[in-house]
Interface confidence: low
Amino acid sequence: MSILKIHAREIFDSRGNPTVEVDLFTSKGLFRAAVPSGASTGIYEALELRDNDKTRYMGKGVSKAVEHINKTIAPALVSKKLNVTEQEKIDKLMIEMDGTENKSKFGANAILGVSLAVCKAGAVEKGVPLYRHIADLAGNSEVILPVPAFNVINGGSHAGNKLAMQEFMILPVGAANFREAMRIGAEVYHNLKNVIKEKYGKDATNVGDEGGFAPNILENKEGLELLKTAIGKAGYTDKVVIGMDVAASEFFRSGKYDLDFKSPDDPSRYISPDQLADLYKSFIKDYPVVSIEDPFDQDDWGAWQKFTASAAIQVVGDDLTVTNPKRIAKAVNEKSCNCLLLKVNQIGSVTESLQACKLAQANGWGVMVSHRSGETEDTFIADLVVGLCTGQIKTGAPCRSERLAKYNQLLRIEEELGSKAKFAGRNFRNPLAK
């Protein structure tokens, strides 16, 4: 069935910033998709087109991207009469029309909005759930429910505390199924809230953009200690492990790292990549840390390579790879990490996201599907993670509706699959291993 009409509009994301929403119509109905937005964007990712008109939304409007959809992309796709199941053809056509390497003509937010809506329409056209359609597009015969990685303590550039490292996550790998993983996550989260309230006061339990807490702590080890305590209090020491997103590019300073970068600059306290690696190794030894994202700067290739070779844990590339096949190829070649963080808006189309995932998996990497800090009620990534069988998703704490929208959709998918539902559990790094 071909596309009858496409209409885009400006809506708001969870941080109150404009973003793109697309309505796509076929004879089967209306298919709606909204595009997420990152607070920090890597220098190697596809361009999110903003208006830069300071008189409107502090320059963050997306009316240009919306106009590109309504005036250029929509007429082209409607006139081509392409079937909505032809995801690759449609994405390729938009990429070709844009004609730039980083989608800077139309904006990745324009192309992705249409791409997501096409994917949703394609599933209905085939009469299958969205996750099954995505599995087909990826060449997967199985579908798998992921382990959720709940970001429950926030630090880094966007938190008002002194904590250098950006995210401290809990992963309920010992759960029997996704529903139990949600229960464990929620119970640990509420225990953590009480622990923080007792130790740092009620204000410390205000939540950040992704639903996590940002208590005023400086030591990263203290963040891990809080998690260990909350996990223990909830009674899940044997079922929950810890993940971190360090976002080290944020405190990289001329070949060294400043773990106190939120204080006045003092180069004498910077540490070397080797010293930072030793700090991570002490975390791994003292806490159940199984995954570290962006442990080094996005261009500190040597440090990545050395650490990945010497640590037995999952090393996730986000700023390093930005879901970009060329960056992934380099990282694979140099054995820089062993897991890809997959963010659809970093590359800007469903097809390229699937290709990036395939490229990573083909080289034995894990893949973690991720939200962005500026989210909407759209639940596409929940179906994406199931269809791609990546086994892991991070989409915030079990708090804030735009985060729960994804987790709730995963609950529905598990229920729909019934006895056929398979949960990644402790195999979250390689859920399809024979």
Epitope: E88, K92, E142, A362, G364, L432
Partner: antibody, heavy 119, light 107 residues
């Protein structure tokens, strides 16, 4: 070093099926996608499809859909390509080719298996 | 499907010559192009990927250029072992398709 060793030549009658094997060594079998490419006598190369041994995901060239099945046996690091309802124009050398670290590049090839379809 | 067209389909040259083979895609494939070398009775060998990158072990006399729809394979100084058939192939999504080949013969 990486090696892909294919099964021997086959002669088949029209309408029959053929199953070609490709045994991989020198690398972790599940870490690379395996493609199949064929070459008719004196002709160019034609991509048939791929299988990802990591998750058994397959993608076939539309031209062969319904006639081709690609499978793997990770315990023996072997990939298989079965082609059904053979016709005389399926006479070709069939190659398995390991996909390099960038998708769509074939950095190692099997020696080829000649399949002759003749009545 | 994306069509790949090579030219010339055959060419004769001498050892030491500089040779250029071109490949045209029916639509924009950015730099998603690979070149292979094939000798009679042998499997193809990867020569260049991503339009211009040489894998380890490929002599530097081989070079690739181009992006979008027009690509070139250049051999700066032909050696006896370079006489073979050369194929281009796009890897901008599936189905991957090959050019019809360019046969390089000794003059």
């Amino acid at each position: 070093q990486v090696q892909l060793v294919q099964s021997g030549a086959e002669v088949k009658k029209p309408g029959a099926s053929v199953k070609v094997s490709c045994k991989a060594s020198g690398y972790t079998f599940t870490s690379s996608v395996m493609n199949w490419v064929r070459q008719a006598p004196g002709q160019g190369l034609e991509w048939m499809g791929y299988i990802n041994p990591y998750n058994d995901g397959t993608k076939y060239n539309e031209k062969f859909k319904g006639r081709v099945t690609m499978t793997t046996d990770t315990s023996t690091s072997t990939a298989y390509m079965e082609l059904r309802s053979l016709r005389s124009d399926d006479t070709a050398v069939y190659y398995c080719a390991r996909e390099g670290f960038y998708y769509g590049n074939f950095d190692n090839w099997g020696q080829g298996t000649l399949v002759t379809v003749s009545s | 499907d994306i069509q790949m067209t090579q030219s010339p389909s055959s060419l004769s040259a001498s050892v030491g010559d500089r040779v250029t083979i071109t490949c045209r895609a029916s639509e924009n494939i950015y730099s998603y192009l690979t070149w292979y070398q094939q000798k009679p009775g042998k499997a193809p060998k990867l020569l260049i990927y991503n339009a211009k990158t040489l894998p380890e072990g490929v002599p530097s006399r081989f070079s690739g250029s181009g992006s979008g729809t027009d690509f070139t394979l250049t051999i700066s100084s032909l050696q006896p072992e370079d006489f073979a058939t050369y194929y281009c192939q796009h890897h901008y999504g599936t189905p991957y398709t090959f050019g019809q080949g360019t046969k390089l013969e000794i003059k």
